[in-house]
Each structure stands twice: as structure tokens, then as C-alpha cells.
């Protein structure tokens, strides 16, 4: 369905409000350092131009591609070279190379100030004074800090953000109403960003086939009553949506996502019995709800998998005729029977099955060769089961903060070259798997835990890719998407690491720690713990625990002191000196 003017087509499909919001997100995700006002100006110019194309699709430049129009607009920014350096060279290229160039310069860890939440009254005043600007600013600030945030989902977050302010700024106790809602949006937003980052990494680093395999497994778990052909259609459409969003084609992505939600709801009888409530909601809520919908019940009396995939004499014939379709059917059949497995485990099983068929279908007696293929699955299934059992036991024993600390020590010893902020951020997130997943019954633990860990380890991979410092991280991140977690789990202490020179400044603390939130205080202590391990990688976990407990006692004492700063200076020197002696620093 070719349109004379792509920009007019998307403007009409999406409506002005969504069009403007999505263009703002796109621009902020590309030019992450540009001031808000500059982006608003660019968006208004693009919107005015789109309106002329709606009025007359044959008007000048209306036939240009969205990449051409948007790229030309971004390249009008006066300070491009001063602000972005070599990214300005993208503007010398032609499409599609120019867009690819912009994509390559997206920064997962932009040097932007932390978002500080103003007082509730200040926020409510700003909201009432200019609601439109207030909400645009939200989109801009999130998009520039999360350059791969799933754009149509960000529109859903913005809608909830607006609803929170609309309700709470009229409440008797504004803060009690608003702050929990903002906390929830922040936490959900970070999780959503990280999940989408994994989808984009999967597409960009491992290709469409890898993403489609992930989607087959996940959708088959979620919609086990749907036919294989139905799941395949959904996978194709979903892949298109995410390819577009990850490629910066946000208007097409949002439009196609809406079409996919419409299709799913029109065909829910052949997809899932769990979609009814979702499909009664407005568009943004509907798409979000479908993406999060619980797994449907498995059909009763599903036959054994072995009949079609091991015992049949036609296995090699079927495989040879259409390899990816046959493997897709295997993955579909296995996944719909195993909502208790993680997606990455299902993909490992499919890969093992594929490798076995590749080998055996060339053998003298193929059937004899692949007859025991399902036996090879047992250790692959048991490994994550055991790991999750051990770590959940450790989590129950230690609680979240100390469990995070155990992981901090574990990962710092594995990859001590990684920057301290990255190790702290990633280990804290790894540690959240406990409270997120260990509460679930056995049947839900593995999909919760291992698929969450895949998301967190991808954060490590994308942050490390920006400034690579560890061959071991590079190896685990690039060799196999589905084996990242087992690869990191298998890493032992890095014996080649030369301990970091001791720097007393790293362990110097001031009275400002006393006024920090509990979370910020934890991060300070965890930063010190990572540095301690980097200085003394051979320290035992008992030694590190003792030093950290003493450090906590020192902070507690000095925060109670009348002259806090003097206490931190004098007692801190003693603590550092004693720690140096005790750990042989």
C-alpha cells in the first residue's frame, strides 16, 4: 500500500498529538544532548510540514522518505559538531547510510545530569501552568536518557504520568498521592527500557533469525492454544514492529503496533482466552496489556513431542525440506508445553536439537544417531534449575541488600576491569532477581529469573561495548545470545588481574552521606565494596563482610556525632588504615 507521501500517511494514521510526541522521542533519542527548546522547535517545523503534505500530498518534498525528512532536519542543528563531535560526519552521508550512522552514535550511557525530582508543589504548578510543555519535557527527558525506549510504550507511560498529576494535584495530600505513583512509573520505566534494549541488541547484534526464535518461544508459551501458523504470523508482525522501533522508525513502529493489537483482538478466539479484558481497553493500554498478558492454559492431552521429532522416520526429510520452519515447529511445540522454562533455555534446547540434526542427518543411520537427543536436554534443564535454587536460598538467608553485595563480590572477582559504577548498577539489578522471582512457585521461577537475568546482563554488555575493557565480557556478550548467562556464571576469579593501586581518596567519606536516602547510602557502600575487591581480589568473603559491617558501624557512629565532618575525617583515617593492614592493601 504505497502512499504518495509517507509523512502525510503517518500523520493521518497516528493523529497530530501522537505524531508530535513520536517525532520528539525520535529526535531526543538521536540528539541526546540538545536542549529541550531546540527539539520542540524542530518538532513544530516537522509537524507544520506534515500538515502541508496532508493538505496536498503532491506538495514539494512530501514524497521524501521519513529518514530523509528527519535526517535533513537533524542536520540543521547549528551546534552539531561542537556538541556531538564525529556524529556530525553522519550529515555528509546519504540515506540509508546517514540513518545507520545516527543509530551507531546512540549512547546508552549519556553524560547527562541525574534527574532530580522537584518539590510536589513546584511540579503541580508547572503541570497546571503548561500541561503540554510539562508532558513533552517528560518524553524528552526519558527518551534522551533511554535512546532505545520502546516509543509507543513511552506514550503509554506519558499517559499514566499525566493521569497521576491530574489526579494528585487536586488531592488533599498531594505528595502522598503522587510520589508512590512516580516511583512506580520510574521503576517500571527502567525495566521497560532494559527489556526493549535486549530486543534491539538481539536484532542488531544477532539478527532477525535470533529475534524471531525468541518471539516464537515466548508467544508459544503465552498462546499455547494458537496454531503454529497463527504464532508464525504474530512473530512476523512483531519482528517488523521491533525492527522499526530499534531502527529509529518510530512512526511506522507505532502504527504497526496498533495494527498488530487490532489484529490480535479481532482474532482472539484463535489466539488466547486471556485477551478479553485487554481488548476492551483504549489503544495504548490495550497494546501494553497484550504485551504483558498472562499465559493461556495449555491445551489438554497434547501428544508426546518424541513422536514427531525423534521417533518419526521423516525427521531428516522434514528438516531438509524447510530447516527453519521445522525448527520453528519444534520450538513452538516445546515452548507451549513448557511455560515453566525460561525462553533462553528453550532456545538452548532448540539449538541442541538443530546441532544434533545437522550432525545426524548426514550420518549412516540418522535415526540411531538422534534417537537419544532428548537425553541431552536433561543437563541443560537442570543447570538453571539448580542455580536458581541455590541463589534463592542465598537470597532468603541474606535479604536483598546483602544478596546484592554477594553478587557484587562475585562479579567484581570475575570481571574486575569493568568500571565500578557499571559493576554496582548491574550487580544491584542482578540482586533484584531475588525479590522479583524467588517468591514465585517452582513452575514460575525459571522463566522469571533467567529471562530477567538476560535483560540485566544485556545492560552489562551494552555498557561494556561503549568502552570495552575485558576480553571475558566481550566473549560472553558476543559468542551466543542465549548462553550469556551460563557464560558469566561459569567465569571464575580472573587470575590475570593486577590489583588496583590503593587510593585513600576512594575510601574517604563525608557528612553528606548522612543525608542521603537509604538507596543512595547503599550505593555508596557498595561502591566502596567493589573498590575494596579491586584492591584486594584475594580477600575472602568473610573478610569483606567484616570490613563492610565495620564500615556501616563507622557511618552510623559519625552520622550520630555532633561534629560529623571531623568524625568522618578522623575515624575514617583509622578505618582505612586498619582495613589496609587487615586486608594487606
Amino acid at each position: 500500500d504505497a502512499h504518495k507521501s509517507e509523512v502525510a500517511h503517518r500523520f493521518k494514521d497516528l493523529g497530530e498529538e501522537n505524531f508530535k510526541a513520536l517525532v520528539l522521542i525520535a529526535f531526543a533519542q538521536y540528539l541526546q544532548q540538545c536542549p529541550f527548546e531546540d527539539h520542540v522547535k524542530l518538532v513544530n517545523e516537522v509537524t507544520e510540514f506534515a500538515k502541508t503534505c496532508v493538505a496536498d500530498e503532491s506538495a514539494e518534498n512530501c514524497d521524501k522518505s521519513l529518514h530523509t525528512l528527519f535526517g535533513d532536519k537533524l542536520c540543521t542543528v547549528a551546534t552539531l559538531r561542537e556538541t556531538y563531535g564525529e556524529m556530525a560526519d553522519c550529515c555528509a552521508k546519504q540515506e540509508p547510510e546517514r540513518n545507520e550512522c545516527f543509530l551507531q552514535h546512540k549512547d546508552d550511557n549519556p553524560n547527562l545530569p541525574r534527574l532530580v525530582r522537584p518539590e510536589v508543589d513546584v511540579m503541580c504548578t508547572a503541570f497546571h501552568d503548561n500541561e503540554e510543555t510539562f508532558l513533552k519535557k517528560y518524553l524528552y527527558e526519558i527518551a534522551r536518557r533511554h535512546p532505545y525506549f520502546y516509543a509507543p510504550e513511552l506514550l503509554f507511560f506519558a499517559k499514566r504520568y499525566k493521569a497521576a498529576f491530574t489526579e494528585c494535584c487536586q488531592a488533599a495530600d498531594k505528595a502522598a498521592c503522587l510520589l508512590p505513583k512516580l516511583d512506580e512509573l520510574r521503576d517500571e520505566g527502567k525495566a521497560s527500557s532494559a527489556k526493549q534494549r535486549l530486543k534491539c541488541a538481539s536484532l542488531q547484534k544477532f539478527g532477525e533469525r535470533a529475534f524471531k526464535a525468541w518471539a516464537v518461544a515466548r508467544l508459544s508459551q503465552r498462546f499455547p492454544k494458537a496454531e503454529f501458523a497463527e504464532v508464525s504470523k504474530l512473530v512476523t508482525d512483531l519482528t517488523k514492529v521491533h525492527t522499526e522501533c530499534c531502527h529509529g522508525d518510530l512512526l511506522e513502529c507505532a502504527d504497526d503496533r496498533a495494527d498488530l493489537a487490532k489484529y490480535i483482538c479481532e482474532n482472539q478466539d484463535s489466539i488466547s482466552s486471556k485477551l478479553k479484558e485487554c481488548c476492551e481497553k483504549p489503544l495504548l493500554e490495550k497494546s501494553h496489556c497484550i504485551a504483558e498478558v498472562e499465559n493461556d492454559e495449555m491445551p489438554a492431552d497434547l501428544p508426546s513431542l518424541a513422536a514427531d521429532f525423534v521417533e518419526s522416520k521423516d525427521v531428516c526429510k522434514n528438516y531438509a525440506e524447510a530447516k527453519d520452519v521445522f525448527l520453528g515447529m519444534f520450538l513452538y511445540e516445546y515452548a507451549r508445553r513448557h511455560p515453566d522454562y525460561s525462553v533462553v533455555l528453550l532456545l538452548r534446547l532448540a539449538k541442541t536439537y538443530e546441532t544434533t540434526l545437522e550432525k545426524c542427518c548426514a550420518a549412516a543411520d540418522p535415526h540411531e544417531c538422534y534417537a537419544k537427543v532428548f537425553d541431552e536436554f536433561k543437563p541443560l534443564v537442570e543447570e538453571p534449575q539448580n542455580l536458581i535454587k541455590q541463589n534463592c536460598e542465598l537470597f532468603e538467608q541474606l535479604g536483598e541488600y546483602k544478596f546484592q553485595n554477594a553478587l557484587l563480590v562475585r562479579y567484581t572477582k570475575k570481571v574486575p576491569q569493568v568500571s565500578t559504577p557499571t559493576l554496582v548498577e548491574v550487580s544491584r539489578n542482578l540482586g533484584k532477581v531475588g525479590s522479583k522471582c524467588c517468591k514465585h512457585p517452582e513452575a514460575k521461577r525459571m522463566p522469571c529469573a533467567e529471562d530477567y537475568l538476560s535483560v540485566v546482563l544485556n545492560q552489562l554488555c551494552v555498557l561494556h561495548e561503549k568502552t570495552p575493557v575485558s576480553d571475558r565480557v566481550t566473549k560472553c556478550c558476543t559468542e551466543s545470545l542465549v548462553n550469556r548467562r551460563p557464560c558469566f556464571s561459569a567465569l571464575e576469579v580472573d587470575e590475570t588481574y593486577v590489583p588496583k593501586e590503593f587510593n585513600a581518596e576512594t575510601f574517604t567519606f563525608h557528612a553528606d552521606i548522612c543525608t542521603l536516602s537509604e538507596k543512595e547510602r547503599q550505593i555508596k557502600k557498595q561502591t566502596a565494596l567493589v573498590e575494596l575487591v579491586k584492591h584486594k581480589p584475594k580477600a575472602t568473603k568473610e573478610q569483606l563482610k567484616a570490613v563492610m559491617d565495620d564500615f556501616a558501624a563507622f557511618v552510623e557512629k559519625c552520622c550520630k556525632a555532633d561534629d560529623k565532618e571531623t568524625c568522618f575525617a578522623e575515624e575514617g583515617k583509622k578505618l582505612v588504615a586498619a582495613s589496609q593492614a587487615a586486608l594487606g592493601l
Epitope: T540, E542, A546, D549, D550, A553, E556, K574, A578, A582
Partner: nanobody, 118 residues
């Protein structure tokens, strides 16, 4: 409540030895790291030695390394400091405390005087 009581201090000639003991009660002694600290006349508190629960990883300040030995007997809820080759600069009030490298507030003993003099 936490109670720590030392004994074994006294006057000793340079080169001599002393063994300090610290009897603990009011807490699960075997579950905590313990430490010895000292305070010389007109000086601040100085960390001397620490030992982890279970008796692991004894650690010493450079000034006493090779001369002092920390140990514990969890069955008797007692911490020890064997001090050999004593020097005049070891003269101080010695305290035992909960902690490994930092004496916890509110968990320190009354102290025992050690004087090294000819």
C-alpha cells in the same frame, strides 16, 4: 546487654611478654569478628588486631606484626592477645571490642593498662 571484661595487663620490661584475655557475654560471641584497640597517653584510639568469627583471617597493625598474636576460644567466649617483644611504645590502655577493623560503638570493654618500662 553486651559485656566485655579484660584481664592480664600490667607492668613489664622491654622485651617481655604479656597475655591479655577478654571475657564476653550478652551476645553470640562466636558469630562476631573481634578486635583489640589501644589508646596511648595523649593519643587517639589505634587499631591493633582483628579476628573473624571462627578464628579466620587474623590481622595486625604494621606496628605489632610479628610480635602480637590474636586468638579466640568460642567455647569459652574469650578473646586473647599474646604480646611478645614488648616495646615502650606499646604502653597504652588496651580494649577489646566487637568488630574486625573498627571497634563498634557501645561494644567496647573498660580497658586494661599495659605499661612497658625498665
Amino acid at each position: 546487654q553486651v559485656q566485655l571484661q579484660e584481664s592480664g595487663g600490667g607492668l613489664v620490661q622491654p622485651g617481655g611478654s604479656l597475655r591479655l584475655s577478654c571475657a564476653a557475654s550478652g551476645f553470640a560471641f562466636s558469630s562476631f569478628p573481634m578486635t583489640w584497640v589501644r589508646q596511648a597517653p595523649g593519643k587517639g584510639l589505634e587499631w591493633v588486631s582483628g579476628i573473624l568469627e571462627g578464628g579466620g583471617s587474623p590481622a595486625y597493625a604494621d606496628s605489632v606484626k610479628g610480635r602480637f598474636t590474636i586468638s579466640r576460644d568460642d567455647a569459652k567466649n574469650t578473646l586473647y592477645l599474646q604480646m611478645n617483644s614488648l616495646k615502650p611504645e606499646d604502653t597504652a590502655v588496651y580494649y577489646c571490642a566487637k568488630g574486625y577493623v573498627y571497634a563498634r560503638e557501645g561494644a567496647r570493654s573498660q580497658g586494661t593498662q599495659v605499661t612497658v618500662s625498665s
